[in-house]
């Protein structure tokens, strides 16, 4: 199901980050350091519960949840928010809440690669990862 | 709980330098960064720049681009700001303080340096 | 740099009396990344409310924050003594970081 993801990927390109980062409503100095760093994506599946763990010297984090069920996350950004991850077509589509807002992180696989889309509101942000 | 210590006043001779220290405790200091923050007698907050102990990336406000340098020694959990050609124009209480990620506000602030620049 | 103005300057409030303080920017920033401080003479500055209206923590509900854009504000239901200080907006939008130049706040 999620096994296409499993594995360690690190960033290779990123467009639009700074801009995803100000529609979301990072501060200045946050998005600075967070658009600097070049982290390692670390995906693993156990039974029916996925791990996505993200490494950099910005700031290491860890989710890990079952597809379909609203879990609470503090985000590399620092935002509590609430998470929801399903697959759809092949994607896994992840949507977070937070302070009335609301933001939609896509990973999916083309080719060899790890795509992830991240979309606020009329922003988009593509971030292309690699098997490390 | 979240404590920056900041040693209480500093007294130096016009054209000498200065390394103000911040001492961070009860939380991972690598996980936010370091702002300072000038204050003149009387007068209002200005904004010197920020470090992010965890990767050593500075920005500095382009007002004190050569005035102030920020380290930091991730061993000892502490925060430096070294103040160059120090004039009269130098002398206020400079604070440090801990940015909490996403909003950037400064969410704990240390007691702060009263520095005297006088002959 | 965005240049942020409060008004009024300086001004005097009776207990129980409804205060505003207002922030008015100089370019439109994210509601997310303007802050409030609260400063007393010969004190550290405190962080008051974050993110326009986020009251931080042990600040009485008295205490409220609004605005979006360029526009925002700083209220105070009913005065009490122990809000007489100094008060600060700051916006984290866009560098440099920059603040207001303060309101002070006197008890009538």
């Known amino acids: 199901m999620c096994d296409a993801f499993v594995g360690t990927w690190k960033l290779v390109s990123s467009e639009n980050f700074d801009d995803y980062m100000k529609e979301v409503g990072v501060g200045f100095a946050t998005r600075k350091v967070a658009g600097m760093a070049k982290p390692n994506m670390i995906i693993s599946v156990n039974g029916d519960l996925v791990t996505i763990r993200s490494e950099s010297t910005f700031k290491n984090t860890e989710i890990s949840f079952k597809l379909g069920v609203e879990f609470d996350e503090i985000t590399a950004d620092d935002r509590k928010v609430k998470s929801i991850i399903t697959l759809d077509g092949g994607a896994l589509v992840q949507v977070q809440k937070w302070d009335g807002k609301s933001t939609t992180i896509k990973r999916k696989r083309d080719g060899d690669k790890l795509v992830v889309e991240c979309v606020m509101k009329g922003v988009t942000s593509t971030r292309v990862y690699e098997r490390a | 709980q979240v404590q920056l210590q900041q040693p209480g006043a500093e007294l130096v001779k016009p054209g000498a330098s200065v390394k103000l220290s911040c001492k961070a405790s009860g939380y991972t200091f690598t996980s936010n960064a370091i702002t300072w923050v000038k204050q003149r007698p009387g007068q209002g907050l200005e904004w010197i720049g920020d470090i992010s102990p965890g990767s050593g990336s500075t920005t500095n406000n382009e007002k004190f681009k050569s005035k102030a340098t920020l380290t930091v020694d991730t061993s000892s959990s502490t925060a430096y700001m070294q103040l160059s050609s120090l004039t009269s124009e130098d002398s206020a209480v400079y604070y440090c303080a801990r940015l909490r990620g996403y909003y950037d506000y400064f969410d704990f602030w240390g007691q702060g340096t009263t520095l005297t620049v006088s002959s | 740099e965005v240049v942020l103005t409060q008004s009024p300057a300086l001004m005097a409030a009776s207990p129980g009396e409804k205060v505003t303080i207002t922030c008015s920017v100089s370019?439109?920033?994210?509601?997310?990344?303007l802050h409030w401080y609260q400063q007393k003479s010969e004190t550290s500055p405190k962080p008051w409310i974050y993110g326009t209206s986020n009251l931080a923590s042990g600040v009485p509900v008295r205490f409220s924050g609004s605005g979006s854009g360029t526009s925002y504000s700083l209220t105070i239901s009913s005065m009490e003594a122990e809000d007489a200080a100094t008060y600060y907006c700051?916006?984290?939008?866009?560098?440099?970081?920059?603040f207001g130049a303060g309101t002070k706040l006197e008890l009538k």
């Open positions: 700051q916006q984290a939008s866009h560098y440099p970081l920059t």
């Open positions: 370019s439109s920033i994210s509601s997310s990344n």
